[in-house]
């Protein structure tokens, strides 16, 4: 292993998964590396194998239990270590003392569906996945709509500052194909970040009614 600047970032999905990315400037040649999780007040520990995602970064998911089980709470502190094999020994490459509920990134919203569509309007709903009951209603959402001839990056962001799992899109163009995405973020946590965007939902507005000939 070659030494270099190292960055180790992890997020908790609020239930039973900690996802980690480790990047190192100096390339690691044919080295086996893992993330080890050691909670301060629990009897279990967990390991995952780091797999390359680019030339100098590796990722893995610590699966702590069944997807909807509440494996950690706000009082837990988990020491996360990157360990790389060096001959017969393991070398600690990075360490993070991790407060799960200060480092949240939820799963992307799922089950997007068109509830009702008109010529200029579309009502869309979705569900959140594997989100802790601790949040109650303390979640916010961002949504975006892809219009013809534009990119996702150009799409204006619509902010829903409450746990509202639906949206009514207005001022749409009749008989036009659109795509829609949504993401979620808990209000809690100093280092909490947005979930990934949902899978896009494609929909088409209804054509305008034809005017009568006189």
């Amino acid at each position: 292993a070659v030494n270099g600047t190292s960055q180790f970032t992890c997020f908790y999905n609020s239930r039973a998964n900690i996802s980690c990315v480790w990047s190192q400037d100096g390339a690691l040649q044919d080295t086996s590396c893992q993330v080890h999780a050691w909670p301060d007040r629990r009897r279990w520990n967990q390991t995952c194998e780091l797999l390359p995602v680019s030339q100098a970064s590796w990722a893995c998911n610590l699966i702590l239990g069944a997807p909807d089980s509440q494996k950690l709470t706000t009082v837990d502190i988990v020491t996360l270590r990157v360990l790389c094999r060096e001959g017969v020994r393991w070398r600690v490459m990075a360490i993070q003392d991790f407060k799960p509920f200060e480092n949240l990134r939820l799963m992307a919203p799922i089950s997007l569906q068109v509830v009702h569509v008109e010529t200029h309007r579309c009502n869309i709903s979705w569900e959140i996945s594997q989100a802790s009951h601790y949040f109650e209603r303390h979640l916010e959402f961002e949504a975006r709509t892809l219009s013809p001839g534009h990119t996702w990056e150009e799409a204006p962001l619509l902010t829903l500052k409450q746990k509202q799992e639906w949206i009514c899109l207005e001022t749409l163009t009749p008989d036009t194909q659109y795509e829609f995405q949504v993401r979620v973020k808990p209000l809690q946590g100093e280092f909490t970040t947005w979930s990934p965007w949902s899978q896009p939902l494609a929909f088409r507005t209804k054509p305008a009614a034809l005017g009568k000939d006189t």
Partner: nanobody, 120 residues
Framework: QVQLQESGGGSVQAGGSLRLSCAAS????????MRWYRQAPGKEREFVSS???????VYADSVKGRFTISQDNAKSTLYLQMNSLKAEDTATYYC??????????????WGQGTQVTVSS
């Protein structure tokens, strides 16, 4: 060889303040996480706070907003400023240093502890 020596403990009334220090020697150029733990009589040792080489801090919920961890790299010293002390903060406080990164920078080291007594 890494050595850690705590100081600054003592007796104080509830609501008072103390500042603990932990002087570190050996392997001072290594990346490390430095932590404070505490152990009350008849209880398990518990995490209090930590600070990483990149200055990122973590606190146990029971001390957040009352305790502040810091370090002076020039003096190789770790500090724990403890304000608004409560009777339940009574414990022996231990400093810990965990080295990482280079192959010669590995290992976990503990100090001998310093006693903090808070009377109500």
């Amino acid at each position: 060889q890494v050595q850690l020596q705590e100081s600054g403990g003592g007796s104080v009334q509830a609501g008072g303040s103390l500042r603990l220090s932990c002087a570190a020697s050996g392997s001072t150029s290594c990346s490390s996480v430095m932590r404070w733990y505490r152990q009350a009589p008849g209880k398990e040792r518990e995490f209090v706070s930590s600070i990483n080489s990149d200055r990122r801090t973590v606190y146990a919920d029971s001390v957040k907003g009352r305790f502040t961890i810091s370090q002076d790299n020039a003096k190789s010293t770790l500090y724990l400023q403890m304000n608004s002390l409560k009777a339940e903060d009574t414990a022996t406080y231990y400093c810990q240093r965990e080295l990482y990164g280079d192959s010669w920078c590995q290992g976990n080291y503990w100090g001998q502890g310093t006693q903090v007594t808070v009377s109500s």
